[in-house]
Structure formats: structure tokens, C-alpha cells
Interface confidence: low
């Protein structure tokens, strides 16, 4: 008799794929535009990325550092009207893209939560949650919560409002902290909270260190649903050595949890991070006309248009990974097991019941390596076969679909492999 199938876990929409942050409408749209009506025109692009949610804004009225002049129920006229927003919600729904609204109050000012009048601000947030839930928003984000006094209790309260309206609504909190204890204390009192932090960017970017960061986090959070990013708002290129960009895309898409990206991550967009100054939003490079004041000769390989036409580009890799992440059970909600690995690399298995299994091998080193994968730590339900088929490599030139011997895997510097193998009873 065939073994009984494992019961499927409850899957919320944010469990099924990546979230995409557009914190700056002007930067994202470029060409001097930057409003909700214009954003509607880019929903097809977001669909092509197979992202499940768009984290938008903040777009509310905020007079810099002025509590009275901050209205979380009003859209800043520079971005458009409530009608424009309703129209965006409707169009996004048709394309199965959920809208998450950033309500970080004082986003134009010095302290995101104002330095005083915490209770007044918290009440404004409560009112805003109720208002925008009625308007059809799918979730909310609040950032810089390390600046919010009694953050845990406020988050619990806001979570109750959100979940009370519908279990299908999401609350994301962002912090600049990379400290695991601080992160855990925020998560402790908030069961379904999705938390973005700088945890992964506090790294020496070796295979060994990354493995220990990931496994510590997963062990500490238990069966709680995680999110994976390198920061609460910035671009991957601001935190990573450039040569590890593809490797991290592969990792973020294949760890158990929701990957969260910022606009431009899919093409390797860069933005200067200047000490002591707010990061100015970079302009999204749609095509060569996005370079308004310099000659853009040879720049196509940096743009969405140029990368869309190149199967070996970062954007093409992003799309392939996002597609796999949203349809394979083992990647959607499978168990995670890290394999024994050397200092240069990190590898793990994702598996769910009798579905196809996935093996991820990441070489963080700047030298090629031969990896003999050790399955010693694996439970019987996740044993390694002798060979697995190569689904994709982060580097061009591999023969995809071909079986690779796991005892004798050779990886190029900074190469990541995604391999698949069947369940065997």
C-alpha cells in the first residue's frame, strides 16, 4: 500500500512567492513621473516577475516631523487621489497581486515615529489600519520599529486589528536591527508578524557564516513562517559584494519563508549609501532612456529591456527562480535540512512528502571547489541520491537538465546550483 500523503499546511497568499517593495514611486517609474496612475501601467511587469505582493509607499500626507500635519488616511496629492488608489487596487486584484501599504508615519522626517507623542501616533496608525482595510488593502508595513517605544505591544494591537478583519491580511514590521535576540523578542508576542531586518547582512559572506546565520534563525524561530531579505528597505547591491548577487537571489528564493525584494534587485540596480544621509531612491532602469544625462552606449545590459532579452541575465534568473518558488511544493512549504559543508560553501535540501525534492549548493568562495556532499545529518525522509538533475546554475554555460554526481560536484567561484531529484519510497 502506498504511504499516506502528508496533510498540506494552511497556505496564506504571502507564503506562495516573493514580495516586491516600491518605496519610492518616482524612482520606480523614472522619467519625472511617479504616481499611482503610472504605477498601474507597470503591473504587467510585476506579473512577469511572479511576485505575490507589492509593498507600496508610504504614500500618505506627511509634513516633515509634524504630527498634526501627518494624515495616514490621506494620500499625498503628488502621488494621486483615493480614486487612483482604488483603481490600482482593482487592477492589481485582477492580476492576483496583493497590495501592502506602508504606513510608517514620519517617512519624510528625521524620526520615522516622531520622537514624542507615541500614543497619538499609535492611535493614528490604528485608525488608518481600519480605514485602509475597509478600502480593500491586503496588508500593511511599518518600518524602523526600533524607534517605536513599546513596539511589541503596539504591533500586537495592530496585528489584532488586521487579523480581526481577516486572517488573509498581512502585517510586516521592519527593523534596522541585525541582533537575533532583539528580533526574537519582537516576534515573540506577534505570531503571524512578518519581520524584515538586517539580520542576514551582518555577515562575513562566507558559506560557513551564512549557514550558521540561517540555521540559527530557523532553529530559534521554530515553525514560525519567516521572511528573508538583507534589509528592511534597501537594495541587495547596497549590502552584498556584487559577485554574490546571483547566489543570494538563489538562496532567498529557496529558503523556507517569504523572500522580500526591493525594486531593482532583479536587475542589480545600485544606489549609493552615504553615511549619515538618507539614501536617495535610485531610478529604475527600464530602458536606455532611463539615462537622461549621459550617453548610454553599451548600457542595455543594465536595463529591464536589455536583460529581458538575455536568457543569461540576472533578471532572467530572477524570473526563473520566482516561477519555481511559486509552483513547487517542496519550495512552497517543504522541510529544510542543511548539509554538512566546508567553509566555502553552504548546501541544503528542501523536501515535501512525496513531491520532487530540491538541493541547493552555494559556493561563496572566490575559488572553484569540489564538493562531496555529506548526507550524514539528514533524517531518513530526506536521504540524498547518488545523482540529481541540474535545474539551473547562477553561471552560464552549464548543461541544464543533465544529472550531476553529488559525490563529485564541481562549482565555479561564486556559483550556485539548484538541483532536483525525485522522492523514492
Amino acid at each position: 500500500r502506498a504511504p499516506r500523503c502528508r496533510d498540506l499546511p494552511v497556505q496564506k497568499w504571502w507564503h506562495t512567492g516573493a514580495l516586491y517593495r516600491i518605496g519610492d514611486l518616482q524612482g520606480f517609474q523614472g522619467n519625472g513621473a511617479g504616481n499611482l496612475a503610472g504605477l498601474k501601467g507597470h503591473l504587467d511587469y510585476l506579473s512577469s516577475l511572479k511576485v505575490k505582493g507589492l509593498v507600496l509607499g508610504p504614500i500618505h500626507k506627511n509634513q516633515k516631523d509634524d504630527v498634526a500635519g501627518t494624515d495616514l488616511l490621506q494620500i499625498d496629492p503628488n502621488f494621486g487621489s483615493k480614486e487612483d488608489f482604488a483603481s490600482l487596487l482593482q487592477s492589481a486584484k485582477k492580476k492576483s497581486i496583493r497590495i501592502i501599504l506602508d504606513l510608517t508615519p514620519n517617512y519624510q522626517g528625521e524620526n520615522s515615529w516622531f520622537s514624542t507623542q507615541v500614543d497619538t501616533v499609535a492611535t493614528k496608525v490604528k485608525d488608518a489600519l481600519e480605514f485602509w482595510l475597509q478600502a480593500g488593502v491586503d496588508g500593511f508595513q511599518v518600518r524602523d520599529i526600533e524607534n517605536l517605544k513599546d513596539a511589541s505591544s503596539f504591533l500586537a494591537e495592530w496585528q489584532n486589528i488586521t487579523k480581526g478583519f481577516s486572517e488573509d491580511r498581512l502585517l510586516i514590521a521592519g527593523t534596522n536591527s541585525s541582533d537575533l535576540q532583539q528580533i526574537l523578542s519582537l516576534l515573540e508576542s506577534n505570531k503571524d508578524l512578518l519581520l524584515t531586518s538586517s539580520y542576514l547582512s551582518n555577515s562575513s559572506f562566507t558559506g560557513e557564516h551564512t549557514k550558521s546565520l540561517v540555521t540559527q534563525y530557523l532553529n530559534a524561530t521554530g515553525n514560525r513562517w519567516c521572511s528573508w531579505s538583507l534589509s528592511q528597505a534597501g537594495l541587495l547591491t547596497s549590502f552584498l559584494p556584487a559577485q554574490l548577487l546571483r547566489l543570494y537571489q538563489l538562496m532567498l528564493f529557496t529558503l523556507p519563508g517569504t523572500p522580500v525584494f526591493s525594486y531593482g534587485d532583479e536587475i542589480g540596480l545600485e544606489a549609493a549609501a552615504v553615511p549619515g544621509q538618507p539614501v536617495e531612491a535610485p531610478v529604475m532602469l527600464w530602458d536606455e532612456s532611463s539615462f537622461p544625462f549621459i550617453s548610454a552606449a553599451g548600457s542595455a545590459n543594465m536595463t529591464v529591456k536589455g536583460q529581458s532579452e538575455d536568457p543569461g541575465s540576472l533578471l532572467s534568473l530572477f524570473r526563473r527562480l520566482s516561477d519555481q518558488r511559486s509552483k513547487e511544493r517542496s519550495l512552497l512549504h517543504g522541510d529544510f535540512h542543511a548539509l554538512s559543508s566546508g567553509p566555502g560553501f553552504f548546501s541544503y535540501i528542501r523536501h515535501w512528502d512525496q513531491n520532487e525534492r530540491f538541493l541547493v549548493v552555494l559556493n561563496f568562495g572566490d575559488v572553484g571547489l569540489s564538493a562531496g556532499l555529506q548526507a550524514s545529518d539528514l533524517p531518513a525522509s530526506a536521504s540524498l541520491p547518488a545523482k540529481a538533475d541540474l535545474l539551473l546554475s547562477t553561471q552560464p554555460g552549464r548543461d541544464e537538465g543533465s544529472p550531476l554526481e553529488l559525490e563529485r560536484l564541481k562549482l565555479e567561484p561564486h556559483e550556485g546550483l539548484l538541483l532536483r531529484f525525485p522522492y523514492v519510497a
Epitope: E270, A272, V274, V283, P292
Partner: nanobody, 125 residues
Framework: QVHLVESGGGLVQAGGSLRLSCAAS????????MGWFRQAPGKEREFVGT????????YYTDSVKGRFTISRDNAKNTVYLEMNSLKPEDTAVYFC??????????????????WGQGTQVTVSS
């Protein structure tokens, strides 16, 4: 404050090569987009090329594409302009510049915050 100093200019025959350096002090430039510009006598300053923060992306004006190469060594806080197959029309004062707000000179805000004093390049026929 960022202080930029160019060096490596000089007199060279047409077809020859030069390597200009731009050494920065006062702050690390690894998070700045860096650009090279030039100004020929009696002409406006013109864009030559730019390099992104990490050095992974470069852009050049059409007239130098394929002949000039910009690179950077963030550990040494220095940016380079390698110039090959030089032509008399490349004669100019060459300036390097730092954009502290952007990783490339590509955003609509544009503009560089810090400039060097320039180094003279003369190409004789």
C-alpha cells in the same frame, strides 16, 4: 569632505596610451558613483564615462567607447581612466568627480558633488 586629486596626464603621440588616476581622501568613495569629464580649450566640459559603486557597471560617451576604460580600486580609494589609441581631439584637461548620492550618474537628479582640479592631457599628431 572628499578631496580628489588627478594624476598621470602628460604629452603623448597620437595612437599612444595614458593611465590617469584619481586618488580620493577625506572619505571612502566605495559608496559613490565616480565619473570622468574633460574640457578642451574654449569648449564646455564634457562627460567621458562613469563607474558604479562596486565597479560592476561602466558607461562611456560614444567617442571614447572601445578606447577608454574606467576601473576602480575601492581598497585604495582610487579610480582610473585607461586611455588607448589616443587622438588629437582627446586633448583636454581631464577631471574626475564623485556623486555622493548615486551609484551611477544615471538618475534624473544628476550632478556631481566633488571635483578634482584636473590633469592636462595633450595628444600631438
Amino acid at each position: 569632505q572628499v578631496h580628489l586629486v588627478e594624476s598621470g596626464g602628460g604629452l603623448v603621440q597620437a595612437g599612444g596610451s595614458l593611465r590617469l588616476s584619481c586618488a580620493a581622501s577625506g572619505r571612502t568613495i566605495s559608496t559613490y558613483g565616480m565619473g570622468w569629464f574633460r574640457q578642451a580649450p574654449g569648449k564646455e566640459r564634457e562627460f567621458v564615462g562613469t563607474i558604479s559603486c562596486s565597479g560592476t557597471s561602466t558607461y562611456y560617451t560614444d567617442s571614447v567607447k572601445g578606447r577608454f576604460t574606467i576601473s576602480r580600486d575601492n581598497a585604495k580609494n582610487t579610480v582610473y581612466l585607461e586611455m588607448n589609441s589616443l587622438k588629437p581631439e582627446d586633448t583636454a584637461v581631464y577631471f574626475c568627480a564623485a556623486d555622493t548620492r548615486h551609484c551611477m550618474g544615471y538618475t534624473k537628479h544628476g550632478g556631481y558633488d566633488y571635483w578634482g582640479q584636473g590633469t592636462q592631457v595633450t595628444v600631438s599628431s
